[in-house]
Interface confidence: medium
């Protein structure tokens, strides 16, 4: 199997950012857990959330109330999450690490860009 994601996700300030992470598995493979983390260079990884295939979403305290699963229907191979109300400080590198059985672990990175629209007065 392999992970499908985007190299760059671009969102306007204040919008919700969908961070995609889909496991394209072979027949019979299942996703056990998806771990999302902020992994900007020079800083330690900061956990966003753990998406457990069986139990659902655990959001780390730093992101409480800001990370959600996309609305149903959900594919059990889809580890995507929503980052609510993006702010400029959210811009950076994110990693999803997917534990599958029986194939093992896969990981992928993406960059989140947050656009700030300036209003011009004439």
């Amino acid at each position: 199997g392999e992970l499908e994601t985007s190299d760059v996700v671009t969102v306007v300030l204040g919008q919700d950012a969908k961070l995609p992470c889909f496991y394209r598995g072979d027949s019979g493979e299942q996703v056990g857990q998806v771990a999302w983390a902020r992994v900007d260079a020079g800083e330690g990884a900061q956990e966003l959330a753990l998406l457990h295939s069986k139990y659902g979403l655990h959001v780390s305290p730093a992101y409480e109330g800001r990370v959600e699963q996309p609305p149903p229907p959900r594919n059990p191979l889809d580890g995507s999450v929503l980052l609510r109300n993006a702010v400029q400080a959210d811009e950076g590198e994110y990693e999803c690490r997917v534990s599958t059985f029986p194939a093992g672990s896969f990981q992928a990175r993406l960059r989140l860009r947050v656009l700030v629209h300036h209003h011009h007065h004439h």
């Epitope: 493979e29 299942q30 056990g32 857990q33 753990l50 457990h52 295939s53 069986k54 655990h58 059985f101």
Partner: antibody, heavy 118, light 105 residues
């Protein structure tokens, strides 16, 4: 012998609180997810809550979210379920179970009865 | 959310007879399915995991089969201690099937 010994059930009034305990022995407790599953009188099995081996990740059924708190003390090999704001519909036998994480519940406690009634 | 439907709800049989219990998933769960046995006043007990593997200490008269959406638990020759309620569950869901009660005819 691998076993789970439960305690802490009883009769409580609506709005009250109760804490259930589940003492584990015979296996490396911190290596396993643990779950609470309940069974209302005459009904089927309903998963309530789960916690990862380290205790860092916790999960809840929508029906108990915000009212119940799962925790564990790995130094004491004990699992807990703190139940607040109890309702009549929480009346059930509560089972703790060792959980293979992504698989199945292979070891179960004998259950403890929680009755919520005025 | 995958829904597991068990049938029949009740199965009335005599000791020595063969019991066939069905569990149907609303979408494919591959072979990641378990069966539990529960006797009155007791905790559930894991019987079968991964659709066809017997858990430790489970007698050979219990067997599981199926994959995808249709699964079967077979008890080849019912013993007195087998009269109980049986639940199916798939690995990446917290939901259990509604159960099948096997009672003495």
């Amino acid at each position: 012998e691998v076993q789970l010994v439960q305690s802490g059930g009883g009769l409580v009034k609506p709005g009250g609180s109760l804490r259930l305990s589940c003492a584990a022995s015979g296996f490396t407790f911190s290596d396993y997810y643990m779950s609470w599953v309940r069974q209302a009188p005459g009904k089927g099995l309903e998963w309530v809550s789960a916690i990862s081996g380290s205790g860092g990740s916790t999960y809840y059924a929508d029906s108990v979210k915000g009212r119940f708190t799962i925790s564990r003390d790995n130094s004491k090999n004990t699992l807990y379920l703190q139940m607040n704001s109890l309702r009549a519909e929480d009346t059930a036998v509560y089972y703790c179970a060792r959980d293979e994480g992504y698989y199945y519940m292979d070891v179960w406690g004998k259950g403890t009865t929680v009755t919520v009634s005025s | 959310e995958i829904v597991l439907t068990q049938s029949p709800a009740t199965l009335s049989l005599s000791p020595g007879e063969r019991a066939t219990l069905s569990c149907r998933a609303s979408q494919s769960v591959s072979s990641y399915l378990a069966w539990y046995q529960q006797k009155p006043g007791q905790a559930p007990r894991l019987l079968i995991y991964d659709a066809s593997n017997r858990a430790t200490g489970i007698p050979a008269r219990f067997s599981g089969s199926g994959s995808g959406t249709d699964f079967t638990l077979t008890i080849s020759s019912l013993q007195a201690e087998d009269f109980a309620t049986y639940y199916c569950q798939q690995s990446y869901s917290t939901r259990f099937g509604g159960g099948t009660k096997v009672e003495i005819k």
